[in-house]
């Protein structure tokens, strides 16, 4: 007799999740020598821990616990990379930028970077036929409950001057309900970060606009500034030569703004 | 699926070069790399290099100053100039694709290179 399956909103687990997290586990492991010691058969029991059997509205960041001990890893707290809404941009800076680090530059957000994941309750299964929709079923699913863990432990190490991209083509370019807005900016931690520096990203070809008088960057930084926390804004009207300029800093065209 | 296509490979003399190219059925972008790895008879697959979709470069301690990778992303492939070759370069040469998204490591045939006098 077929077992009765809760029908969740969001999309299922992502097709080879196991063969997925552990590839991805021992090709890091391989392209970052600090992290040889990472046993990857061990991380991908405690990520499969933190979620099969457990009811997927019912996670807690305790249940992430032992993952995020076995992907302990130190960045330079002050070359953190922070965004929201511009992932891809993100990445390519730090891919130019090798010594600036994003979440998904980190142990633990490449392994689970774009795929989604839940379990059963009660049963060792994984479930590839659907998973709980933030906002439809449960903010306290497997995938809403990691990222969230992980951005807290990321912003907490972070100090100096941490800099966060935002894309100047949203209606909210600083959007409170993002990870950025709700969780990444509170747990900054004020005795060590001096400057969030703001990176706005423009969309259009022609858009000269100041965006960093947005009224949402201005309410960005009426809350940074009220957790003693300094705030700078740059307007990025050109992405594609940033980029470029990142990568070749001493070509003549770099000089002006970007 | 990705397919590699190699090729290359050959005897040259110490000091020599050779340069080897990869012709890959998609392309490089996002987390992807390609890259080419060894195997000398009797020892354990190593990588020689590896490129990224902006790019960026890693190489083996053994290869560094002597060896160039690059690639052309409108062609879908990736080169290996080998410059100053060493006996104990000689070995299988594989190209990979790593498939970042997917998790998976696709590799080539393998083309032969062999240094010797």
């Known amino acids: 007799v077929p077992r009765w399956r809760q029908q969740w909103s969001g999309p299922g687990t992502t097709k080879r999740f196991p063969e997925t997290v552990l590839a991805r586990c021992v090709k890091y492991t391989e392209i970052h020598p600090e992290m040889r010691h990472v046993d990857c058969q061990s991380v991908w029991d405690a990520f499969k821990g933190a979620f099969i059997s457990k009811h997927p509205c019912n996670i807690t960041e305790e249940d992430y616990q032992p993952l995020m001990k076995l992907g302990t890893q130190t960045v330079p707290c002050n070359k953190i990379l922070l965004w929201s809404r511009i992932k891809d941009l993100a990445h390519q800076f730090t891919q130019v930028q090798r010594d600036m680090f994003t979440l998904e530059d980190t142990l633990l957000g490449y392994l689970a970077d774009d795929l989604t994941w839940c379990g059963e309750f009660n049963t060792s299964k994984i479930n590839y036929q659907s998973c709980p929709d933030w906002r439809k079923d449960c903010s306290n699913n497997p995938v809403s409950v990691f990222w969230k863990t992980v951005s807290r432990r990321f912003a907490e190490a972070a100090c100096d001057v941490v800099h966060v991209m935002l894309n100047g083509s949203r209606s909210k370019i600083f959007d409170k309900n993002s990870t950025f807005g709700s969780v990444e900016v509170h747990n900054l931690q004020p005795e060590k970060v001096q400057t969030l520096e703001a990176w706005v990203i423009h969309g259009g070809r022609e858009d000269s606009r100041d965006l960093c008088q947005d009224p949402t960057i201005k309410e960005l930084e009426s809350i940074i500034s009220k957790r003693n926390i300094q705030f700078s804004c740059k307007n990025i009207y050109r992405p594609d030569k940033f980029l470029q300029c990142v990568k070749n800093p001493e070509d003549s065209s770099c000089t002006s703004e970007i | 699926q990705v397919q590699l296509q190699e090729s290359g490979g050959g005897l040259v003399q110490p000091g020599g070069s050779l340069r080897l190219s990869c012709v890959a059925s998609?392309?490089?972008?996002?987390?992807?790399?390609m890259g080419w790895y060894r195997q000398a008879p009797g020892k354990q697959r190593e990588l020689v290099a590896r490129i990224a979709s902006l790019g960026i470069t890693n190489y083996a301690d053994s290869v560094k100053g002597r060896f160039t990778i690059s690639s052309d992303n409108a062609k879908n492939t990736v080169y290996l100039q080998m410059n100053n070759l060493k006996p104990e370069d000689t070995a299988v040469y594989y190209c990979n694709y790593w498939h970042y998204a997917a998790g998976r490591d696709y590799w080539g045939q393998g083309t032969q290179v062999t240094v010797s006098s």
């Open positions: 998609e392309r490089i972008f996002s987390r992807n790399t």
